[in-house]
């Protein structure tokens, strides 16, 4: 039975031209994390595999940095980066856990971080 929960940074905002850390955390399970995918609805940004290390999609190589930890740093943000981002944790023996982050990239300097929330 899958007992874990994914905690994410939830709804977040950042300024155009700045950077943001996308972070998920898996808790309440002893399952082993073997891979984490970072994706948009129709595009894979990055994969962190326990054996193979990090893979960054060529389309994002210039603007995406691995880490911290299993998170992902997006740099040189544009308004087009606004949207949903998903972390997909591959675990053994539980299977996959997924979390959602919504990023809003703002033109002005009124960006604030949203509250953390959990997805069961």
């Amino acid at each position: 039975m899958m007992t874990g929960t994914i905690e994410t940074t939830g709804n977040i905002s950042a300024e155009k031209g700045g950077s943001i850390i996308l972070q998920c955390h898996l808790s309440s399970t002893t399952a082993q994390v073997t891979q984490v995918n970072w994706e948009q609805q129709d595009q894979l940004l990055a994969i962190c595999n326990a054996d193979l290390g990090w893979h960054i999609s060529p389309s994002f190589k210039d603007r995406v940095a691995p880490g911290p930890g299993l998170g992902l740093t997006l740099q040189s943000l544009t308004v087009n980066d606004t949207g949903e981002y998903f972390c997909i944790y591959h675990t053994y023996p539980d299977g996959t856990y997924t979390g959602r982050i919504f990023l809003e990239v703002l033109e002005s300097s009124v960006a604030e971080h949203g509250a953390r929330f959990q997805i069961p």
């Epitope: 894979l44 994969i47 949903e84 591959h90 996959t96």
Partner: antibody
């Protein structure tokens, strides 16, 4: 349990349109993306496009852009794929499929039974 | 678009045999490959996702491996119900693309 039930077989004339439905049950319809895939007789699988039933957002294979329209009706938990300007090469079995996880990667864990569309004059 | 090339296109094997099917991507797709089994007149069934993760309920005789451009589906001991066509699919980028299929027939 998760089920995707598709509409029945269709026979169409070249130039006509066809609309295939896919009724979902056993899960929260708006939480999972629905994909459409087709398979011509004796051939492999070809991805047509995807819809997010929650937002209505779509993405299409460039090959089908302008001819395929994917929609979803939240009130009936039904996704639709309409293909216009039909030609004989569109004769195929059309499948709807659902991703395995909420927000998950594009591997397809649940499939409809398929709808045969025959285009013939 | 990313092309997925499977080999062989067909093979003959006996019950109990170890069977290996390969899939090559036209560019690096990391581990974003799934494998499906399809029987005549039926919808495909998911076997493996993310190159090596066995989907829930799939027998452990099926396994997947590979990363980058080269991927393998292995059936450790072929069972009568495994005679079918197998497809690889990349879930790395849009449009999603499939291999042309490998038909596993009875020898």
């Amino acid at each position: 349990q998760v089920q995707l039930v598709q509409s029945g077989a269709e026979v169409k004339k070249p130039g006509a349109s066809v609309k295939v439905s896919c009724k979902a049950s056993g899960y929260a319809f708006t939480n999972y993306l629905i994909e459409w895939v087709r398979q011509a007789p004796g051939q492999g699988l070809e991805w047509i496009g995807v819809i997010n039933p929650g937002s209505g957002g779509t993405n299409y294979n460039e090959k089908f852009k302008g001819r395929a329209t994917i929609t979803a009706d939240k009130s009936t938990s039904t996704a639709y794929m309409e293909l216009s300007s039909l030609r004989s090469e569109d004769t195929a079995v059309y499948f709807c499929a659902r991703r395995g996880d909420k927000y998950g990667s594009a591997w397809f864990a649940y499939w409809g039974q398929g709808t045969t569309v025959t285009v013939s004059s | 678009d990313i092309q997925m090339t499977q080999s062989p296109s067909s093979l003959s094997a006996s019950v109990g045999d170890r069977v290996t099917i390969t899939c090559r991507a036209s560019q690096d797709v990391s581990t974003a490959v799934a494998w499906y089994q399809q029987k005549p007149g039926k919808a495909p069934k998911l076997l493996i996702y993310s190159a090596s993760f066995l989907y829930s309920g799939v027998p452990s005789r099926f396994s997947g491996s590979g990363s980058g451009t080269d991927f393998t589906l292995t059936i450790s001991s072929l069972q009568p119900e495994d005679f079918a066509t197998y497809y690889c699919q990349q879930h790395y980028s849009s449009p999603r693309t499939f291999g042309q299929g490998t038909k596993v027939e009875i020898k």
